[in-house]
Amino acid sequence: FSLEASEEMEQEPCPAPISEQQEQVLTVALGQPVRLCCGRTERGRHWYKEGSRLASAGRVRGWRGRLEIASFLPEDAGRYLCLARGSMTVVHNLTLIMDDSLPSINNEDPKTLSSSSSGHSYLQQAPYWTHPQRMEKKLHAVPAGNTVKFRCPAAGNPMPTIHWLKNGQAFHGENRIGGIRLRHQHWSLVMESVVPSDRGTYTCLVENSLGSIRYSYLLDVLERSPHRPILQAGLPANTTAVVGSNVELLCKVYSDAQPHIQWLKHIVINGSSFGADGFPYVQVLKTTDINSSEVEVLYLRNVSAEDAGEYTCLAGNSIGLSYQSAWLTVLPAEEEDLAWTTATSEARYTD
């Protein structure tokens, strides 16, 4: 939870809690307003004092997941619980005690109170991670030329500062071609068009007067090796459709070099599916480059029995060709219940 000084409580979600399901004792000065947020969400959270749920109006109220005390009085001291509605699990367990003098900042304890210029009470706290789930990917192995973003979203009071280190040394990107992008409000470091010399350990150091935290990322830059297009396995997929329906065949293409894509339908000429050269007879249905909007989807509208057959996604670049095929089966309308889709396909590669 946090004790807030924001004037924007009704519009912004509560900051992330410092510690959940932990008992905490806070000392509040006589007459101070108190505003406590329960977790990251205002929904489904209720405040209780000494076992009784707080009303949503009045001098002391539980409202939208917040505990608000207009002006702290001796009788407001006591034990407060924030419970999740439904499960009734304890989200926060908090004891407020009164002190008739404002506390001084105790550097040993990140949970002491101070007074803001507006008179609202708020929590002095050491830095903490607000979105640790965004920091789970420690190793970033990326192809050369890509953009890399490291982030260490944090909070604290006073608001912490963030500094970045590369291999243990202060990092400002001055020696890096293209420099770096630091967004302090998003606690992020961005490097565009990475090169092998960007490899290393990147550490964010977040600190304020009450403490510091750090986290390290590992960056490996993979040098690109030229290759023919790679087609995602299983696509296009064998598909069964009903006469009159619409069909989409999907082909996912990965290629460093600019790929050229064709959708082909295998056809029969003079009773044969193959020419004298051993190559299949095909009809080109669609030709495109990968950066147009629908490059990898073949749309077949209002299919008929004649549309049944083998379809191939052919992708080529300066290195070579790759292709994968799938079969479309078209059923009469009365057999609609039998329609299904499977995801098997053949893959072939040629240089």
């Epitope: 924001s6 004037e7 924007e8 519009q11 912004e12 607000t130 979105h131 965004r134 990917k137 990326v142 192809p143 890509n146 953009t147 973003k149 979203p153 992008r181 630091l182 967004r183 302090h184 409000q185 998003h186 606690w187 961005v190 565009e192």
Partner: antibody, heavy 119, light 107 residues
Amino acid sequence: QVQLLESGGGLVQPGGSLRLSCAASGFTFSDYAMSWVRQAPGKGLEWVSVIEGDGSYTHYADSVKGRFTISRDNSKNTLYLQMNSLRAEDTAVYYCAREKTYSSAFDYWGQGTLVTVSS
Amino acid sequence: DIQMTQSPSSLSASVGDRVTITCRASQDISSDLNWYQQKPGKAPKLLIYDASNLQSGVPSRFSGSGSGTDFTLTISSLQPEDFAVYYCQQHYSPSHTFGQGTKVEIK
């Protein structure tokens, strides 16, 4: 409630200049990064520029780099976009948008102001 | 810059249909992807942020999924007010590029 109101659009000749403003209310302006996003008639959205809450960071789309300047006056709760060397392809509705905290999602948008570059 | 490719560019659907729109990034963008809805003459509206988080006030029939390069916006049961243009937007790189849009029309 949060409100963003753009102004300053209009008709300008190629090579001319224009300054757009975005008046913000209903939130602590200096706490939020702000962006400009534009939309040419009948086309999709194109991000133009961003500025941090304290003005310490700015960034621009390649298409406007060197011609447009984003700025803000937190004492007036106002965001600006100075547009110089305007081209026909800059013709668009320009929106100002607020970024969510900890993310770059635009959670509030203005109604837009139309900039027409034509001789 | 990171390129964002949406598909399809347009689709026709009926009220009650389940609709899926996909967005692909030209490189890994983690979960730094947002989805917007725009109706004619109006400003865009944020639906989903960071790939899968529903923006406050947005109906629960909208959902987002994906990470890395492939992302999906799903409308579980299309309502009359959902006919609009939908855009994805990446914010992994400093230039926050949008997809070209997907127009959802009435069948």
